[in-house]
């Protein structure tokens, strides 16, 4: 039966995808055939075939970026070291080990789901402008994050969430495969408005909040909250 595992990694980091037999196992590298593939498209990530050093079957996206340790394989550790993780690496990987002395029977099958994350930049909230006499518009921008973010606007006076119908979010996938987000908030003009923009990265359980005020010159400091304690309201509402 195939074992199933999950692992998380930051964009640009290196990660180990675990695939190992119980401790104390010994393997002959002239006997085992080891394959790492992506589970869906069956893209070849790397492999070991006895007496064959060529890796011509490896997909160009993984060439020189995915390695197994020969010393590890001898003791039954067929884990994959994946270097410089990219957003495109967020998928399921399948490790398969066959023994030729057992008639090419599978001796190990492991599926590892890789979740990829990247921190969003601290949001930048533009100074409010007035498209009309009775309306204020704020723009919040944050870039280079992963996965796709959630954006919330907060009334900083009581830390309540503003109605999401008031905001218009545009999320772009940039050249690096990371997400950029621009959120435009339109609210009724009042004498003094104290609002905040919150960018939530669900995978990292991280929220970045920046405030903006009208009616005075005091700017709210940027805040980052990780692994918050839930308050019963929507998580992003009270990260300050």
């Amino acid at each position: 039966d195939t074992q199933e595992k999950e692992v998380r990694a930051m964009v640009g980091s290196d990660v180990e995808l675990s695939c190992a037999c119980p401790e104390g196992s010994r393997f002959d590298l002239n006997d085992v055939y080891v394959y790492w593939q992506t589970s869906e498209s069956k893209t070849v990530v790397t492999y070991h075939i006895p007496q064959n050093s060529s890796l011509e079957n490896v997909d160009s996206r993984y060439r020189n970026r995915a390695l197994m340790s020969p010393a590890g394989m001898l003791r039954g550790d067929f884990s994959l070291r994946l270097f410089n993780v990219t957003p495109q690496d967020e998928q399921k990987f399948h490790c398969l080990v066959l023994s030729q002395s057992l008639g090419f029977q599978e001796v190990l099958s492991v599926e590892v789901t890789l979740h990829v994350a990247a921190n969003f930049s601290v949001p930048v909230v533009s100074a409010p402008h007035s498209p009309s006499q009775d309306e204020l518009t704020f723009t919040c921008t944050s870039i280079n994050g992963y996965p796709r973010p959630n954006v919330y606007w907060i009334n900083k006076t009581d830390n309540s969430l503003l109605d999401q119908a008031l905001q218009n979010d545009t999320v772009f996938l940039n050249m690096r495969g990371l997400y950029d987000v621009v959120s435009v908030l339109r609210i009724a003009r009042t004498p003094s408005v104290n609002i905040g923009c919150c960018i939530e990265n669900v995978l990292l359980q991280q929220n970045l909040t920046v405030g903006s005020q009208t009616g005075n010159d005091i700017g709210e400091r940027d805040k980052i909250t990780e692994n918050p304690v839930s308050t019963g309201e929507k998580n992003a509402a009270t990260w300050s």
Epitope: S39, K42, N57, L96
Partner: antibody, heavy 121, light 107 residues
């Protein structure tokens, strides 16, 4: 233990259709290329059709192109061969085979026991 | 497709004889060659893979050699149960193609 069990063979009239099925067990079916190989009475082995792991690539011997369709259902560990417009020369034992994982050489073919298809009026 | 040419197409031999069958590929296939034995009404049985590796459970009187385009299957001392048809198959690339077979008969 690796097992491949074919079904769906039998006697069919020329111009008729038949659908062969093969169920694999004892291995991770979705990780391997699979194929159908046939052997006419008293003749040698002839590959008929190949299919990649995810079904995205298929290859057919010239003599069956346009008449036979290979497909697979990885959720059911099953391989299929839909045979239409059958001819007398398609009479053969049809073997389901587990092939390799890579495009270029890796592991040898593993064979099912075969099933007889007879095309005759 | 890679063409596989086997010779001879048939041979007669006696128990105890040394038998050699050759297989030639139309282009280089490194050592990605398998040999199969087939008896009437049976599926092919794997004997040799990667040109020279003996499948587990196969008697040591069977051996394979060769690389590139020319390959040989040798039965060092023919036994009564060895009378069968032998096929080579390249698995360097798809489609995996076969030789036409060599029938080993009793003299």
């Amino acid at each position: 233990e690796v097992q491949l069990v074919e079904s769906g063979g039998g006697l069919v009239q020329p111009g008729g259709s038949l659908r062969l099925s093969c169920v694999g067990s004892g291995f991770t079916f979705s990780s391997y290329w699979m194929s159908w190989v046939r052997q006419a009475p008293g003749k040698g082995l002839e590959w008929v059709a190949y299919i990649k792991q995810d079904g995205s690539e298929k290859y057919y011997v010239d003599s069956v192109k346009g008449r036979f369709t290979i497909s697979r259902d990885n959720a059911k560990n099953s391989l299929y061969l839909q045979m239409n417009s059958l001819r007398a020369e398609d009479t053969a034992v049809y073997y389901c085979a587990r092939d390799g994982i890579l495009w270029f050489g890796d592991i040898p073919t593993y064979w099912g026991q075969g099933i007889l298809v007879t095309v005759s009026s | 497709d890679i063409q596989m040419t086997q010779s001879p197409s048939s041979l007669s031999a006696s128990v105890g004889d040394r038998v050699t069958i050759t297989c030639r590929a139309s282009q280089g296939i490194s050592n990605w060659l398998a040999w199969y034995q087939q008896k009437p009404e049976k599926a092919p049985k794997s004997l040799i893979y990667t040109a020279s590796s003996l499948q587990s459970g196969v008697p040591s009187r069977f051996s394979g050699s060769g690389s590139g385009t020319d390959f040989t299957l040798t039965i060092s001392s023919l036994q009564p149960e060895d009378f069968a048809t032998y096929y080579c198959q390249q698995y360097n690339s798809y489609p995996r193609t076969f030789g036409q077979g060599t029938k080993v008969e009793i003299k």
